[in-house]
Interface confidence: low
Amino acid sequence: GVTSAPDTRPAPGSTAPPAHGVTSAPDTRPAPGSTAPPAHGVTSAPDTRPAPGSTAPPAHGVTSAPDTRPAPGSTAPPAHGVTSAPDTRPAPGSTAPPAH
């Protein structure tokens, strides 16, 4: 993992996201990824926080919808989280997400 990196959440990763959480290694939150995120979290490796992926996310984590725009995914969504590997908060990966 990364101890520190950028100051934002991870940027989009290049692999499919996991189920409930996001894994990342940067210092910022990930920017939008190019694949669908999973249900509860996102996995990535940047230093920022992950941003929405471009593929379908999973299906578990939150009970109510947010007040901001969702990031549309272009593929079937995974179950709980997103996996990615940027330096900001992890963003969805660029491959198909898991099931759950």
């Epitope: 950028p6 934002t8 920017a31 941003a51 578990h60 995974p78």
Partner: antibody, heavy 128, light 112 residues
Framework: QVQLVESGGGLVKPGGSLRLSCAAS????????MSWIRQAPGKGLEWVSY????????YYADSVKGRFTISRDNAKNSLYLQMNSLRAEDTAVYYC?????????????????????WGKGTTVTVSS | DIVMTQTPLSSPVTLGQPASISCRSS???????????LSWLQQRPGQPPRLLIY???NRFSGVPDRFSGSGAGTDFTLKISRVEAEDVGVYYC?????????FGGGTKVEIK
């Protein structure tokens, strides 16, 4: 029932070490990002460290970088914080916290990034 | 690092009356994905913090509707429409847009 239970706190001398543990139950631990957040006596909240669901990504506050190591064992549903070279200013209640990143459904992803489950905390006192 | 500044430090309130807490960040909390990851937490005496509001204005499950959040960019507000005895405690704002995650210093709500 979703629960986080911390243990391992105690009294230690400056320069000493402690290993905190957090036992998770009631949810699929391996799906979530986790953090340690601390609160010094009578003070506010301070984020200490974060680890991704798989354990591959880790972040630390500057105040603990190089001294603390976060890790997890998804097979045991456990989160850990190895604290070395402890200082008086590390005295605090340490909370194990689950972070919900969001979810995806119907081709759309919804991101939240909120801390929705907190343990009751374990107290670490660093004093000679 | 993003610095979160809360005001007031203490807010003595009469039961049944409204209360308002302000939180200001040293830089915009709008993430590159367009979301603003600003949460509000409540910490009652002797208890761990509890999530009240996420992403500025979304009430978390089980949170009474007398709690509401608003704001944008760098300025945010938590309002309690009618303070009840169980609302006594310290309230914190927190940003999760970027690392390190940071909290406001806290606002103590007490009954007059």
């Amino acid at each position: 029932q979703v629960q986080l239970v911390e243990s391992g706190g105690g009294l230690v001398k400056p320069g000493g070490s402690l290993r905190l543990s957090c036992a998770a139950s009631g949810f699929t631990f391996s799906d979530y990002y986790m953090s340690w957040i601390r609160q010094a006596p009578g003070k506010g909240l301070e984020w200490v460290s974060y680890i991704s669901s798989s354990g591959t990504t880790k972040y630390y506050a500057d105040s603990v970088k190089g001294r603390f190591t976060i890790s997890r064992d998804n097979a045991k549903n456990s989160l850990y914080l190895q604290m070395n070279s402890l200082r008086a200013e590390d005295t605090a209640v340490y909370y194990c916290v689950r972070e919900n990143i969001g979810y995806c459904t119907g081709g759309n992803c919804f991101y939240y990034y909120y801390m929705d489950v907190w343990g009751k905390g374990t107290t670490v006192t660093v004093s000679s | 690092d993003i610095v979160m500044t809360q005001t007031p430090l203490s807010s003595p309130v009469t039961l049944g009356q409204p209360a308002s807490i302000s939180c200001r960040s040293s830089q915009s909390l709008v993430h590159s994905d367009g979301n603003t990851y600003l949460s509000w937490l409540q910490q009652r005496p002797g208890q761990p913090p509890r999530l009240l509001i996420y992403k500025i204005s979304n009430r978390f499950s089980g949170v009474p509707d007398r709690f509401s959040g608003s704001g944008a960019g760098t300025d945010f507000t938590l309002k309690i429409s009618r303070v009840e005895a169980e609302d006594v405690g310290v309230y914190y704002c927190m940003q999760a847009t970027q690392f390190p995650l940071t909290f406001g210093g806290g606002t103590k709500v007490e009954i007059k």
